[in-house]
Amino acid sequence: LKGQEFAPSHQQVYAPLRADGDKPRAHLTVVRQTPTQHFKNQFPALHWEHELGLAFTKNRMNYTNKFLLIPESGDYFIYSQVTFRGMTSECSEIRQAGRPNKPDSITVVITKVTDSYPEPTQLLMGTKSVCEVGSNWFQPIYLGAMFSLQEGDKLMVNVSDISLVDYTKEDKTFFGAFLL
Amino acid sequence: LKGQEFAPSHQQVYAPLRADGDKPRAHLTVVRQTPTQHFKNQFPALHWEHELGLAFTKNRMNYTNKFLLIPESGDYFIYSQVTFRGMTSECSEIRQAGRPNKPDSITVVITKVTDSYPEPTQLLMGTKSVCEVGSNWFQPIYLGAMFSLQEGDKLMVNVSDISLVDYTKEDKTFFGAFLL
Amino acid sequence: LKGQEFAPSHQQVYAPLRADGDKPRAHLTVVRQTPTQHFKNQFPALHWEHELGLAFTKNRMNYTNKFLLIPESGDYFIYSQVTFRGMTSECSEIRQAGRPNKPDSITVVITKVTDSYPEPTQLLMGTKSVCEVGSNWFQPIYLGAMFSLQEGDKLMVNVSDISLVDYTKEDKTFFGAFLL
């Protein structure tokens, strides 16, 4: 085990080995967002499809009420892509009266909530100014990284403007995590 | 095993454990595309370098004819980046006669083909309007996520405009997958 | 092991199995960069936070002097996001005298240094023209892929313009790697 020959003459306790297929994993896909009450001073959280099409949760990784629930402590790779689409931002009214406009922006945040901790923790943020000249624009923001999570932690995806999220296809906007 | 002390007094069947180094893995890098016939009504698929430079396939993950072949069922992390480069799109002709132009766009799709299923499945899509003011533009689209795949599935990368793919460097445009 | 029943009657050597929690891993986060001497003809390397906040290194993966040190040969997933921010590039001076300007650009490179090899190897590059019309712009470049690394290899993140890197939040600019 762990690269050593089996040796019955001495009993050893090894670090936990586990089948990879047993590990908590989830891939969630976009659904149309319904208008809901959002927390004040916090970007609204997206809700997700967790079992139809490409979406799944397995091995005690559960999805409930916009949150992915972490069932076991460890290092997780967490990722999300959100595709935004909108109409031309004011910013394309090229330098009205010589005054540059403040650009509009789009932002995605992957947030961790720990019940024992009062404030959510922002794990990942992708933020982009939007200053398009054409009539309608669309673009994705992708995020992914590894974090040490504790059993009971909850993960969610927040966006700056929920009405700009492209909900039309499960391959455009998604959210996932897996235990390494 | 699996965190328990070795106990010869009772025989147990464990979930499959495997050496991580045995798992199917591939990282493919860009090669220049030559004009070829593509399937009608489908974005053209890229072909790839699979053994020179940074590229490799291992542990029965094979590359053939634009496809990565999945040798074993399981959950895979799949990723790709495509760097596009082009000249100013018409869309930069700022609002000709007050009429906003439809923006050009660039799109990358990672597609799964299952022989027993008639239609390819789009796993991941990155799509972006391109409306640049400068003379020549360049930008990457990155995608990555986890999917449950079956032995025999085939993966490919399709792009909206094959002639805009930057083929000059193996670190700019790539495609990979590994069994978790 | 490896899916077979425990069989004490014959001694077997198995491929190395290891606890996933033992594997080298790191997630580094942005810190404010101090002006330093950079190598000629090479983009400057970022330095990183490796223990505070979300940042960590574990299982012999060490961070020292802008480099992540690879402690063990194997296949690693490597990722980074750099968020850039800046003022309008000249390129937004829409087509002065009918002549489109060359766009400014932002570039991130993840580089491997092997002591026995004279030249660094560029593993991943994200490069984007910046041609924004609004007054101030910001945007991320994300990269991630799998590479076969050797014990002793060193990884760093280089950027085209260190003064444009957004160092304000640990979730906006980061760098990580983990053994698969």
Epitope: - | R32, P35, M87 | -
Partner: antibody, heavy 118, light 107 residues
């Protein structure tokens, strides 16, 4: 295999227009940019512009901007280059070419000789 | 516009010789540099792309190098069929421009 077949030689008077065709086969016509390059007798190569057959978008060299029109007919996989207000120094072989990337010319047509003479 | 220059404008060489042609751009074109071979009365033939990559079917005696502004085409051992004119071309930005050509003649 990939082929570009151009229309035949033309003789034109100064001030007239010429329209050269280029029929593509062996590849997906709409997937690759099609370029026009000319070569005056005994001279080097000069890029005139491209057409993106998928969108109909064009990019012309400044020198030809007000005289050239590039079009395509996707139903018959054919591109056209029309040059107007011809002058004697437009006498050249006109090539169409297609590239796997938009910045290079993998496959060339056989060329069309256009002679402008009074 | 980006100007491309080539040197020499012509050269005489024998079969088996090593021949080097240089191409210079008026500004950096990274590695977006292509080489073509043209024989009299024929259309150009694509040889090298991305400064150093051989187009499929091109003999390995041809090689390219360089990046930025300075580039080289080398024929390691000149063959009878290599006598032709060679053009470099930048694909960095439009208008795409060619060098004036280098004519390789039999000594």
């Amino acid at each position: 295999q990939v082929q570009l077949v151009q229309s035949g030689a033309e003789v034109k008077r100064p001030g007239a227009s010429v329209k050269v065709s280029c029929k593509a086969s062996g590849y997906t016509f709409t997937a690759y940019y099609l370029h026009w390059v000319r070569q005056a007798p005994g001279q080097g190569l000069e890029w005139m512009g491209w057409i993106n057959p998928k969108s109909g978008g064009t990019n012309y060299a400044q020198k030809f901007q007000d005289r050239v029109t590039m079009t395509g007919d996707t139903s018959i996989s054919t591109a056209y280059m029309e040059l107007s207000r011809l002058r004697s120094d437009d006498t050249a072989v006109y090539y169409c070419a297609v590239g796997g990337s938009y910045d290079a010319f993998d496959i060339w047509g056989q060329g069309t000789m256009v002679t402008v003479s009074s | 516009d980006i100007q491309m220059t080539q040197s020499p404008s012509s050269l005489s060489a024998s079969v088996g010789d090593r021949v080097t042609i240089t191409c210079r751009a008026s500004q950096s074109i990274q590695s977006y540099l292509n080489w073509y071979q043209q024989k009299p009365g024929k259309a150009p033939k694509f040889l090298i792309y991305g400064a150093s990559s051989l187009q499929s079917g091109v003999p390995s005696r041809f090689s390219g190098s360089g990046s930025g502004t300075d580039f080289t085409l080398t024929i390691s051992s000149l063959q009878p069929e290599d006598f032709a004119t060679y053009y470099c071309q930048q694909g960095y930005s439009t208008p795409f421009t060619f060098g004036p050509g280098t004519k390789v003649e039999i000594k």
